[in-house]
């Protein structure tokens, strides 16, 4: 019993002695956040100069504050212990960790392309001011029917088949029926439209191919090799739609 007590006391003394030795050997470890260990002044803790900070103790230098300029605006001012935080000016939104980039906003029903904001193609939607146009939900995958048609601004709403429930009432997450819904006239006309569009695309690419053979391959290569740029322009192009099919993927009141 006495032996274990002796061991504990000895360990504590060793730890305390180590801490004391460490602070004697490295006086910088005593410098708190908001200061730096100044080698030019006999390792005295000096406060960080203006427009700089140190978020942890024992630092030998202070970091330069981030400056929110141009399309960035200051969300939180820099202090001696923490960096400034930026967000984006109206009409832009943050991208990346700590809002490292600002990307142009688009209207609902649009997506940002290298040519600016473009309307979502038929069959796709975007209900936000950022991101890409996504295909409407395919209700039949869940054995459900379309309750409300989609638009470029909003997704379709799925619901149970009309036979499943009385008019007006519907379950938000109804059980999926086992049977596949029959081919309605809408589906047939949709597939006809899809086939004719595919044929038109085929004709277009054939024509393009022959014109490229004549004029050389340089121009076509340039079109496909051009990097995707995030334009920082404020004009919104609304002519035509962006036909790129992506992968699936406050108020004060009193009552």
């Amino acid at each position: 019993m006495g032996n274990s007590c002796y061991n504990i006391v000895a360990t504590l003394l060793l730890v305390l002695n180590f801490e004391r030795t460490r602070s004697l050997q490295d006086p910088c470890s005593n410098c708190p956040a908001g200061t730096f260990c100044d080698n030019n002044r006999n390792q005295i803790c000096s406060p960080c100069p203006p427009n700089s900070f140190s978020s942890a103790g024992g630092q030998r230098t202070c970091d330069i504050c981030r400056q929110c300029k141009g399309v960035f605006r200051t969300r939180k001012e820099c202090s001696s212990t923490s960096n400034a935080e930026c967000d984006c000016t109206p009409g832009f939104h943050c991208l990346g960790a700590g809002c490292s980039m600002c990307e142009q906003d688009c209207k609902q029903g649009q997506e940002l392309t290298k040519k600016g904001c473009k309307d979502c193609c038929f069959g796709t939607f975007n209900d936000q001011k950022r991101g890409i146009c996504r295909p409407w939900t395919n209700c039949s995958l869940d054995g459900k029917s379309v309750l409300v048609n989609g638009t470029k601004e909003r997704d379709v709403v799925c619901g149970p088949s009309p036979a499943d429930l009385s008019p007006g009432a519907s379950s938000v997450t109804p059980p999926a029926p086992a049977r596949e819904p029959g081919h309605s006239p809408q589906i047939i006309s949709f597939f006809l439209a899809l086939t004719s569009t595919a044929l038109l695309f085929l004709l277009f690419f054939l024509t393009l191919r022959f014109s490229v053979v004549k004029r050389g391959r340089k121009k076509l290569l340039y079109i496909f090799k051009q990097p995707f740029m995030r334009p920082v322009q404020t004009t919104q192009e609304e002519d035509g739609c962006s036909c790129r099919f992506p992968e699936e993927e406050e108020g004060g009141c009193e009552l």
Partner: antibody
Framework: EVQLLESGGGLVQPGGSLRLSCAAS????????MSWVRQAPGKCLEWVSV????????YYADSVKGRFTISRDNSKNTLYLQMNSLRAEDAAVYYC????????????????????WGQGTLVTVSS | QSVLTQPPSASGTPGRRVTISCSGS????????VTWYQQLPGTAPKLLIY???HRPSGVPDRFSGSKSGTSASLAISGLRSEDEADYYC???????????FGGGTKLTVL
């Protein structure tokens, strides 16, 4: 049956922090958008934040941006709300809410509303 | 001030019909689906209407929703004493990148 149970509320001083949890059961947690909604005593509902299951995207009300962080652990069927730099105006009952429309089949849940709610946990901010 | 405007109170006698309005703008109600919630005293809200006008299973057909332009309405017919509650409209607001609730309407059954 959908069950949502909030915890972690309590008394905290202005400038303090609190972490709320919401334990979910009775549905496939990893397939639904989840929100936090708050209600100050005698006041109206105020949406706080939402997190999507597929891409992990998060959105916040302007009043809490930069102070609150929503997160989820799909393996534990739990939703979290980390609240820092708390102010007197953050005092409210905080509800955890499940959105309708299962993902990834459903692309957007905004049409389906919040079809499941917890009973709420009270957060008091006072010195 | 809430983004969506609702009348603070509404009232009606049993058996009658009452309508609660909710007005917004093109960035919220105009281009997005409206949902309605009922909050009985001392309880959590309950979804009443989704996608502008559809009822989840279990909600009586006395409740109906409609939308026109940047305004939405909730109608309750055959009013009952148990309908006495706070009613909220809500939708997604793309310009705020978030959901918005109305200020709520306190319904009193006289």
């Amino acid at each position: 049956e959908v069950q949502l149970l909030e915890s972690g509320g309590g008394l905290v001083q202005p400038g303090g922090s609190l972490r709320l949890s919401c334990a979910a059961s009775g549905f496939t947690f990893s397939g639904y958008d989840m929100s936090w909604v708050r209600q100050a005593p005698g006041k109206c509902l105020e949406w706080v934040s939402v997190i999507y299951p597929d891409d992990g995207n998060t959105y916040y009300a302007d009043s809490v941006k930069g102070r609150f962080t929503i997160s989820r652990d799909n393996s534990k069927n739990t939703l979290y709300l980390q609240m820092n730099s708390l102010r007197a105006e953050d005092a409210a009952v905080y509800y955890c809410a499940k959105h309708g429309g299962q993902k990834p089949t459903t692309k957007s849940s905004s049409a389906y509303g919040m079809d499941g709610w917890g009973q709420g946990t009270l957060v008091t901010v006072s010195s | 001030q809430s983004v969506l405007t609702q009348p603070p109170s509404a009232s009606g006698t049993p058996g009658r019909r009452v309508t609660i309005s909710c007005s917004g703008s093109s960035s919220n109600i105009g281009n997005n689906y409206v949902t309605w919630y009922q909050q009985l005293p001392g309880t959590a809200p309950k979804l009443l209407i989704y996608a502008d006008s559809h009822r989840p299973s279990g909600v009586p057909d006395r409740f109906s929703g409609s939308k026109s332009g940047t305004s939405a309405s909730l109608a309750i017919s055959g009013l009952r004493s148990e309908d006495e509650a706070d009613y909220y409209c809500a939708t997604w607001d793309y310009s705020l990148s978030g959901y918005v609730f109305g200020g709520g309407t306190k319904l009193t059954v006289l």
